[in-house]
């Protein structure tokens, strides 16, 4: 069985300020389990944008159900964009465990914030 | 508002131990990396010791083996263990919320920590 | 461990002159380096990230330029406010974060 691909298609997303951004994330197989994490940043200090287990996102909601097991679509939408959201934004795959490891990381989105449409 | 409050700095002799905390408030902490600072007197800032936000840790040269940088999201609280202390530890210690492109945005008032004996 | 070299040590301006700054890395950092603004018994502010760009709540008189391992911070007219030490920051590289040994500004 071929191994789990992380696919983010949009390499990169221009969203106006003050519309929603939608950054699409799929993966390739239900193996192995475990949750699927947003980050803005790649490195140490990246920023947890999204958890799919658990935490406190009151800007972002999933585009499909995440919830359901059969679910393969991590797609977001961050509702009210502002320059300050910008950067490259990674969809990540964990494995289930005590704690959840790192499994597979997708490429990246590069989210750019253009200035409000006057 | 954000706020990062320190507190454990102390006075302490060679080889003895310390524990710091920070207490953040005004942002979702889970959902950061954190980090320790330390600036001795006189000179620059100094960075100790980072934990993301999977808990993963990271440390100066000067530091590794004997700090221990660790959170609790349930409490919004960072802590740096401090073992086997020398007289080069003398510093202030100062908490930073640090972003995913790697600038120090907020910062503590710190904590003094004098290692004398 | 890009090692970040400032200078000149002190800087003794009268207000209303220009501040001129430099920070010099030992290898390229890009656009990412960042100055902070440490005033007596406080802890480091954030002025300026990516080179240029002003953090939230600086003043326009703030201004950073350069890129790869040669940056510079203008206070183009120093108010008597602006008496602090300034250290600049590399931002590209991770662990560890540097910071230069800084600059101490002072109003005559």
């Known amino acids: 069985e071929e191994e789990l691909q992380v696919i983010q298609p949009d390499k990169s997303v221009s969203v106006a300020a003050g519309e929603s951004a939608i950054l699409h994330c799929t993966v390739t197989s239900l193996i192995p389990v475990g949750p699927i994490q947003w980050f803005r940043g790649a490195g140490p200090a990246r920023e947890l944008i999204y958890n799919q287990k658990e935490g406190h996102f009151p800007r972002v909601t999933t585009v499909s159900e995440s919830t359901k097991r059969e679910n393969m679509d991590f797609s977001i939408s961050i509702s009210n964009i502002t320059p300050a959201d910008a950067g490259t934004y990674y969809c990540v795959k964990f494995r289930k465990g005590s704690p959840d490891t790192e499994f597979k990381s997708g490429a990246g989105t590069e989210l750019s914030v253009r200035a409000k449409p006057s | 508002d954000v706020q990062l409050v320190e507190s454990g700095g102390g006075v302490v002799r060679p080889g003895e131990s310390l524990r710091l905390s920070c207490a953040a408030s005004g942002f979702t902490f889970s959902n950061f990396a954190m980090t320790w600072v330390r600036q001795a007197p006189g000179k620059g800032p100094e960075w100790v010791s980072l934990v993301s936000v999977t808990a993963t840790t990271y440390y100066a040269d000067s530091v590794k083996g004997r700090f221990t940088i660790s959170r609790d999201n349930s409490k919004s609280t960072l802590y740096l263990q401090m073992n086997s202390l020398r007289a080069e530890d003398t510093a202030v210690y100062y908490c930073?919320?640090?972003?995913?492109?790697?600038?120090?945005?907020?910062w503590g008032l710190g904590t003094l920590v004098t290692v004398s004996s | 461990e890009i090692v970040l070299t400032q200078s000149p040590g002190t800087l003794s301006l009268s207000p209303g002159e220009r501040a001129t700054l430099s920070c010099r890395a030992s290898q390229t950092v890009g656009s990412k380096l960042a100055w902070y603004q440490q005033k007596p018994g406080q802890a480091p502010r954030l002025l300026i990230y990516?080179?240029?760009s002003r953090a939230s709540g600086i003043p326009d008189r703030f201004s950073g330029s350069g890129s790869g391992t040669d940056f510079t911070l203008t206070i183009s007219s120093l108010q008597s406010e602006d008496s602090a030490v300034y250290y600049c920051?590399?931002?590209?590289?991770?662990?560890?974060?540097?910071f230069g040994g800084g600059t101490k500004v002072e109003i005559k």
């Open positions: 920051q590399q931002h590209n590289d991770w662990p560890p974060y540097t």
């Open positions: 990516d080179s240029s």
């Open positions: 930073a919320k640090i972003t995913w492109n790697n600038l120090f945005d907020y």
